[in-house]
């Protein structure tokens, strides 16, 4: 049953004289193993014999023996699956039909395979994509319907006869579906590859040429342009003429439109291959190119930089930074459009040339107030000298300078006067906006920079002011030199150091703490009576009569100041003692008689002693001696003695007469 045999193999195999053929082949004999195999060349069925006639290239028998002449052909198969064959070498006359006669126990089959052997190696075939565009990667394929294990070959790519640098990937197929060798080359064609010949060359293992295929590249690309300019350096002066020509060196497909661009912007009404610029101005400086389009897209030429040279334009000055603070650094930049760029600069400050400053930038490392003003510059190039522009103003800011505190009053200033001071300065930038004063006080500022001190104190010594803008500058303090009457006048005892005793030498000092002016006069006074005009008041031998309330006065040209009253106390022993009797020195018996010891003493008498006419001390120690009732025998002379811390004093005798009462006389 023929349907039971299933074969798979390439339909036709290709080779050339001297090469080899490898025939991949599989089969399936469903009724059992293969028992006999014969390979025929161009088999023909003989109906008479019911057998195939033809050249037998290979024959296998049941005992597996193969005739020696059949070594050229090899059956590489097996008894149930594989029917692969190899013919090595293959000859031209091997072309035709190969017949595989297969016999199993019960079935037979003839499988036919076509073999095409050429006299010389046949060429490979180059396959190209339908369209090639510049810079787009394409894959070139070189295909050869040949591959054989016993005959190695290689495929090499050439461009215009020169091996291509790109690495090709070669693959082979020896399968029941196909037999081929293929080389694939990835390649990014440039416009310059258009029309170039690409070759795929078949070589043997030694690199010997066998055959090739060639194709001409058709690379689609935008127009390729060349721009030519007169003059060739594209450097002209204002008023000159310039011609630019656009040449198309290649375009595939043909170009359709032409235009010109300046600095990337299309120039209107310029649609020819020549651009004529007459009497150019500096504004026409720039980058020019031509643009030509085809179906692929627009192509642009290289840019031509047209330089229209001109003398420097009026310059401007840029200041970094204004306003500037005194002591900071400042940079000036001279800006002037010119072509070529200026080579020399002249700088001016307030109209005067700044010597030695010839560069685009001027640097002042430490700004001073007199750097303020207008800075201008002039730029110069080979075509001429520009004009001086308006310049830029440098504002130099600094604290108020030379600040002084000025006393507006006529001198001298007296304590209690109203003093007016002003805060003056030489210059300031920005303007002074406020003032400060030291020391602080509850003082009036009637106007900016003026200080009014009402009722100036004697101790207002110095005042300083500051004038302030963004900074404060302090003046040196000014002395008010306030004049005042002597202060803190007081009486001070110089000697003796202890209490004053009658007879002592005594000195009193008139002290004061301060006086301005310093020249002073002194006056001593007791009970409104002038005693002296020296700073000291001296007593050679003080007496109790000198005790009392003393004041001293100190005066200067401003006024006089009195001390507080000072009490002078003289200590002395009891004196001027006398015994006084009450109600009198004649008293009737039985009545009351009081004897008083009167004295003058400082300190007062602390202890009294009474004596009778016999100089007998009496047992009484108080100032008063009371006799009640008085007796006649009390009559007699009495005296007293007073004692204080200084000493003792005694009185003269005083006689008390006690007379009888009428009753006593009546009784007698």
């Amino acid at each position: 049953d023929s349907s039971k045999w299933v074969f798979e193999h390439p339909e036709t195999l290709y080779a050339w004289e001297g090469a080899c053929v490898w025939i991949p082949c599989t089969y399936r004999a469903l009724d059992g193993d293969l028992e006999s195999f014969i390979l025929f060349h161009n088999p023909e069925y003989n109906k008479n014999t019911s057998k195939f006639d033809g050249t037998r290239l290979y024959e296998s028998t049941k005992d597996g023996k193969v005739p020696s002449e059949q070594k050229r052909v090899q059956f590489l198969g097996d008894k149930n699956k594989n029917c692969t064959l190899s013919i090595h070498p293959v000859h031209l006359n091997d072309s035709g039909q190969l017949g595989l006669r297969m016999e199993s126990k019960t079935e037979k089959w003839m499988e036919r395979i076509h073999l095409n052997v050429s006299e010389r190696p046949f060429p490979p075939h180059i396959q190209l994509p339908p369209e090639i565009q510049e810079s787009q990667e394409v894959t070139l394929t070189c295909l050869l319907n040949f591959s054989c294990y016993g005959y190695p070959i290689q495929l090499q790519w050439l461009l215009e006869g020169v091996p291509m640098r790109q690495a090709a990937v070669t693959s082979t197929s020896l399968t029941i579906k196909s037999v081929f060798t293929r080389s694939e080359l990835k390649f990014s064609p440039q416009w310059s590859h258009h029309g170039k010949i690409v070759t795929c060359q078949l070589q043997d293992a030694d690199g010997k040429f066998l055959s090739n295929d060639t194709v001409q590249l058709n690379v689609k690309h935008t127009p390729k342009l060349e721009i030519k300019v007169t003059p060739s350096d594209a450097i002209v002066r204002e008023g000159d003429s310039v011609t630019m020509t656009c040449e198309v060196s290649s375009s595939n497909p043909e170009y359709t439109t032409v235009s010109w661009l300046k600095d990337g912007t299309s120039l209107k009404k310029q649609n020819t291959f020549t651009l004529n610029l007459r009497e150019v101005t500096k504004d026409q400086s720039g980058k020019y190119c031509c643009q030509v389009s085809n179906d692929v897209g627009p192509g642009r030429s290289e840019e031509v930089f047209l330089q229209v040279q001109y003398a420097p334009e009026p310059s401007t000055v840029q200041i970094l930074h204004s306003p500037a603070v005194e002591g900071s650094q400042v940079e000036f930049l001279c800006m002037s459009l010119a072509n070529p760029l200026p080579t020399n600069y002249t700088w001016y400050h307030n109209g005067k040339e700044m010597q030695g400053r010839t560069e685009e930038k001027v640097h002042i490392p430490k700004i001073l107030p007199w750097h303020a003003g207008t800075y201008s510059c002039v730029a110069e190039n080979i075509l001429g000298t520009g004009q001086r522009g308006p310049g830029a103003e440098l504002d130099v800011q600094y604290p108020p300078k030379k600040v002084t505190t000025v006393i507006q009053n006529p001198m001298p200033i007296r304590e209690g006067d109203t003093v007016t001071l002003s805060c003056n300065y030489n210059s300031s930038n920005p303007s002074v906006t406020r003032y400060e004063w030291k020391p602080h006080g509850a003082w009036e500022e009637p106007s900016l920079g003026v200080l009014k001190i009402q009722n100036v104190g004697w101790d207002n010594t110095t005042i300083a002011c500051a004038a302030c803008n963004s900074w404060c500058s302090w003046a040196s303090p000014v002395a008010l030199n306030v004049q005042y009457a002597p202060r803190d006048v007081r009486v001070r005892k110089i000697k003796p150091l202890s209490e004053i005793h009658s007879g002592n030498s005594v000195s009193l000092q008139c002290d004061f703490s301060s006086s301005h002016p310093k020249e002073v006069q002194f006056f001593w006074e007791k009970n409104g009576r002038l005693l002296g005009k020296e700073s000291q008041l001296n007593f050679d031998s003080i007496s109790p009569e000198d005790a009392g309330s003393y004041s001293c006065w100190v005066n200067n040209s401003i006024g006089q100041t009195a001390s507080k009253a000072w009490t002078l106390e003289v200590l002395y022993a009891p004196r001027r003692l006398r015994v006084s009797m009450s109600p009198g020195d004649q008293v009737m018996e039985g009545k009351s008689a009081t004897l008083t010891c009167e004295s003058d003493a400082n300190p007062p008498v602390s202890h009294y002693t009474w004596f009778d006419w016999n100089n007998q001390s009496l047992p009484y120690h108080s100032q008063k001696l009371r006799l009640e009732p008085v007796k006649v025998q009390h009559s007699g002379a009495y005296w007293c003695q007073g004692t204080n811390s200084v000493g003792k004093g005694r009185s003269p005798l005083s006689t008390l007469t006690v007379y009888y009462s009428p009753e006593t006389i009546g009784r007698r």
Epitope: W370, H371, K401
Partner: antibody
């Protein structure tokens, strides 16, 4: 710290030339002008010339024909060269720093030059 | 060239006193005037620039004034360390010129 230091030969023979180097530190020669000033013994100060920040020079007309000032920015040095020295060129030579609008704020210590055979 | 004239070559002043040194320019110098102090054996030292601007570190007893062509350096309360020669210099235009100097001595 700003410093200027002059180095000179000390003794020069009459009719010979004088070369002095001023080496500066603490500032750049492209930011400050350098002047040369001399002071004969017991006499006053005399300005000889200046090297401006931009590299230009200016000379006292009395010395124009025999004076040249140059500099080497990379070494921070300014050079004075004076030809045809006579005995009355004996002086202390100072290099000093200034800038536009400023006075001469820093002076070298001076180098003493004696012209004698 | 602008000529700078210092009328006094020598000045003798008492300690603590006030001294005024004058300098006259042959042309207007727009206040671009400097004063220098030179002590024996030393390089000059800048005291005042721009006619009035006191350099940092210079005692406040030094002051400058003037305008146009006439300029003054004042020292109040003279100290022993102020004994020196004082030079004026114009920095208005080249050649920069100096005054002949005023030597200050203590009386």
């Amino acid at each position: 710290e700003v410093q200027l230091e002059e180095s000179g030969p000390g003794l020069v023979a009459p009719s010979q030339s004088l070369s002095i180097t001023c080496t500066v530190s603490g500032f750049s020669l492209t930011r400050y002008d350098i002047s040369w000033i001399r002071q004969p013994p017991g006499k006053g100060l005399e300005w000889l010339g200046v090297m401006w920040t931009g590299g230009g020079t200016n000379y006292n007309s009395a010395f124009m024909s025999r004076l040249s000032i140059s500099r080497d920015n990379s070494k921070s040095q300014v050079f004075l060269k004076m030809n045809s020295l006579q005995t009355d060129d004996t002086a202390i030579y100072y290099c000093v720093r200034s800038y536009y609008g400023s006075a001469m704020d820093y002076w070298g210590q001076g180098t003493s030059v004696t012209v004698s055979s | 060239d602008i000529v700078m004239t210092q009328s006094s070559s020598y000045l003798s002043v008492s300690l603590g006193g006030r001294v005024t040194i004058t300098c006259k320019a042959s042309d207007h110098i727009n206040n671009w005037l400097a004063w220098y102090q030179q002590k024996p054996g030393n390089a000059p030292r800048l005291l005042i620039s721009g006619a009035t601007s006191l350099e940092t570190g210079v005692p406040s007893r030094f002051s400058g004034s003037g305008s146009g062509k006439d300029y003054t350096l004042s020292i109040t309360s003279l100290q022993t360390e102020d004994v020196a020669t004082y030079y004026c210099q114009q920095h208005w235009s080249t050649p920069f010129t100096f005054g002949s100097g005023t030597k200050l001595e203590i009386k």
